[in-house]
């Protein structure tokens, strides 16, 4: 799966919608890495 | 309210270097990554590389490696490129750009910064 | 690296017409594909994520489809205000590359 900066991004938003924003506050684009997915 | 505001144009002898700043407001600089691309005149655009502004680590395209360093100053919510050895082939406006989730998921751009190489 | 190509540079439409911007990538980039607007003299101004998503504020006339290396920007009822050029982008692999774009003239 893609791996990049910006699908790394994506992912993330997708997390935090699907998941009504309850995440940790470190749960960040910047903070972690293709292995969170 | 998002905004990434570069620094104003600049005008640069050949073989000297230049540093162009991105600053950002509006949300927490540290958690996305800052792009730069570039778009010479009248062509598209050419991606240079990113840095994230948590550790410092960038990646560039290769086409980009030893001429652009980008750099980040987390105290003040900067973003920085350098470009060195300038030629005329460097004239373009470079742009910033982040992909921000919080407060709003979009792609935000700065309005570009026009450098010219000329003697 | 990956070559992004649009079947065309300039395309004509009139106002309320349908029009497709196609972008062709070199190889497989999945549904990694973004779209850009650019008016003159403005930045650049993000459409659509991920090949078929648009970004909030974007009008829902803006849409995206493709996946693997087929990607199209199709606007539907366009208005004058459509008039500009635009950019395919692929973020599946660094480094990241846009196609060289297709200027939008309005009748």
């Known amino acids: 799966s893609c791996n990049t900066a910006t699908c790394v991004t994506h992912r993330l938003a997708g997390l935090l919608s699907r998941s009504g924003g309850v995440v940790k506050d470190n749960f960040v684009p910047t903070n972690v890495g293709s292995e969170a997915f | 309210e998002v905004q990434l505001q570069q620094s104003g144009p600049e005008l640069v002898k050949p073989g000297a270097s230049v540093k162009i700043s991105c600053e950002a407001s509006g949300y927490t600089f540290t958690d996305y990554y800052m792009n730069w691309v570039k778009q010479s005149h009248g062509k598209s655009l050419e991606w240079i590389g990113d840095i994230n502004p948590n550790n410092g680590v960038t990646t560039y395209n290769q086409k980009f490696k030893g001429k652009a360093t980008l750099t980040v100053d987390k105290s003040s919510s900067t973003a920085y490129m350098e470009l060195r050895s300038l030629t005329s082939e460097d004239s373009a406006v470079y742009y910033c750009?982040?992909?921000?989730?919080?407060?709003?998921?979009?792609?935000?751009w700065g309005q570009g910064t026009t450098l010219t190489v000329s003697s | 690296d990956i070559v992004m190509t649009h079947s065309q540079k300039f395309m004509s439409t009139s106002v309320g017409d349908r029009v497709s911007v196609t972008c062709k990538a070199s190889q497989n980039v999945g549904s990694n594909v973004a779209w850009y607007q650019e008016k003159p003299g403005q930045s650049p101004k993000a459409l659509i994520y991920s090949a078929s998503y648009r970004y909030s504020g974007v009008p829902d006339r803006f849409t995206g489809s493709g996946s693997g290396t087929d990607f199209t920007l199709t606007i539907s009822n366009v208005q004058s205000e459509d008039l500009a050029e635009y950019f395919c982008?692929?973020?599946?692999?660094?480094?990241?590359?846009f196609g060289g774009g297709t200027k939008l003239e309005i009748k």
């Open positions: 982008q692929q973020y599946n692999s660094y480094p990241y590359t």
């Open positions: 750009a982040s992909i921000i989730i919080v407060p709003d998921y979009f792609d935000y």
